[in-house]
Interface confidence: medium
């Protein structure tokens, strides 16, 4: 029987800068029941606080609700593992909520083949930002990537759309069925997961771009 091994805070994520969750990996348990507690303080403070919510994020997590989340302050946090034989501490992790935002995927991806009379045909797609993200406040700049591939192809073709919520693609293989997905990323944060695939059939008379 031994004191617990050193835990590790391995991930912190926020869906929208208003709340966030951190997760830790336990170390070895030393063969005894082990209790874990996460403590934190904010930049410029020395007063330590305990995790406000160990439930919402699931096992080995700490969730910070709206009233505990400050956007402009760095959080300094640590996990303490304790059993009857002693304690061990994780390394401290510094968390700035601005940097850990991982939004939900964009919504309402629609894809259409456009065949204007006077120009070459193209694939046109548009989407909406995730609902949890409020772009009107100016706190967020969301960047978008699109990827697409013929249904049976192995490789994706990826395009960067910047801040646009619509995009055109000219060079496509006629007669092929394409999968299209979009994802988003705040300027300082993480890419979202890809949206569910939208399928589009390219007509056989689609003229390839020269």
């Amino acid at each position: 029987q031994l004191p617990p091994g050193k835990p590790e805070i391995f991930k912190c994520r926020s869906p929208n800068k208003e709340t966030f969750t951190c997760w830790w990996r336990p170390g070895t348990d030393g063969g005894l029941p082990t209790n874990y507690s996460l403590t934190y303080h904010r930049e410029g403070e020395t007063l330590m606080h305990e995790c406000p919510d160990y439930i919402t994020g699931g096992p080995n997590s700490c969730h910070f609700g709206k009233q505990y989340t400050s956007m402009w302050r760095t959080y300094v946090m640590m996990v303490n593992a304790t059993n009857q034989m002693g304690s061990s501490f994780s390394d401290e992790l510094y968390v700035d909520v601005t940097y850990i935002v991982q939004p939900d995927p964009p919504l309402e991806l629609t894809v259409e083949v456009k065949q204007p009379e006077d120009r070459k045909p193209y694939l046109w797609m548009k989407w909406s930002p995730p609902t949890l993200i409020d772009l009107k406040t100016g706190w967020f700049t969301l960047l978008y990537e699109i990827r697409l591939k013929p249904e049976k192809a192995a490789e994706w073709e990826t395009h960067f759309a910047g801040q646009q919520t619509e995009f055109k693609i000219l060079s496509l293989h006629p007669g092929q069925k394409y999968l299209v997905q979009v994802r988003c990323k705040p300027d300082h944060g993480y890419w979202s997961a890809w949206s569910p695939a939208t399928f589009i059939q390219i007509p056989s008379d689609f003229i390839m771009n020269d």
């Epitope: 805070i9 991930k11 020395t46 300094v76 501490f89 401290e92 992790l93 510094y94 700035d96 850990i100």
Partner: antibody, heavy 120, light 113 residues
């Protein structure tokens, strides 16, 4: 106002011992990691050692491991560096540096330095 | 150990000019847990201790003029002075605090012509 005042430097022969001190004021000393960084004359900066709030957490550069010991006395707001088996290549200005938090990163305040000269 | 390499070693620039100093780490210092780059920039003037300018690769220390900015991620970082002033003559160092031993770049000496 944060102040860090190093002392204890001087001339010492190779193989000798010195104990550097750093008196801290203007902040809650016990809440922050502290480090020693040195600079040989005309050269760049070299991290030497750090100590976290939990005094058992100490870290050393390979070049000083086994010869230097960092410690702190939170009741006296003082950081120490005990330097044994000194070599000519240890000659440098030794700076005491405060980290932002209780473990180590970005040294936000530095002392003026104390000069250690190892020579026969 | 993580090796930090700065370029150039020295730089002579006109007053008011935009100035950039580069720093490359031998391995990534971006931590996936918090999306932070564990990199700092310091300024050292002759006869004085270093002064922290930038931490987390891009966060300006309080009191540092806003002509100083940091950028980059992973292994490649840049310190930019948007309009060089006479008081910016100094040696500039980058430092990684991702892993011990914490290591510094060799320094970039900035002078005015």
């Amino acid at each position: 106002e944060v102040q860090l005042l190093e002392s204890g430097g001087g001339l010492v022969q190779p193989g000798g011992t010195l104990r550097l001190s750093c008196a801290a004021s203007g902040f809650t000393f016990s809440a922050y990691a502290m480090s020693w960084v040195r600079q040989a004359p005309g050269k760049g900066l070299e991290w030497v050692s750090s100590i976290n709030v939990r005094a058992g957490d100490t870290y050393y550069a390979d070049s000083v491991k086994g010869r230097f010991t960092i410690s702190r006395d939170n009741s006296k707001n003082t950081l120490f560096l005990l330097m044994n088996s000194l070599r000519a290549e240890d000659t440098a200005a030794y700076y005491c540096a405060k980290a932002r938090y209780s473990s180590n990163w970005g040294f936000d305040f530095w002392g003026q330095g104390t000069l250690v000269t190892v020579s026969s | 150990d993580i090796v930090m390499t700065q370029s150039p070693d020295s730089l002579t620039v006109s007053l008011g000019a935009r100035t950039t100093i580069n720093c490359q780490s031998s391995q990534t210092i971006l931590h996936s847990s918090n999306n932070h780059n564990y990199l700092a920039w310091y300024q050292q003037k002759p006869g004085l201790p270093p002064k922290l300018l930038i931490y987390w690769s891009s966060t300006r220390e309080s009191g540092v003029p806003d002509r100083f900015s940091g950028s980059g991620s992973g292994t490649d970082f840049t310190l930019t002075i948007s309009s060089l002033q006479a008081e910016d003559v100094a040696i500039y160092y980058c430092q990684q605090y991702s892993n011990t031993p914490y290591t510094f770049g060799q320094g970039t000496k900035l002078e005015i012509n």
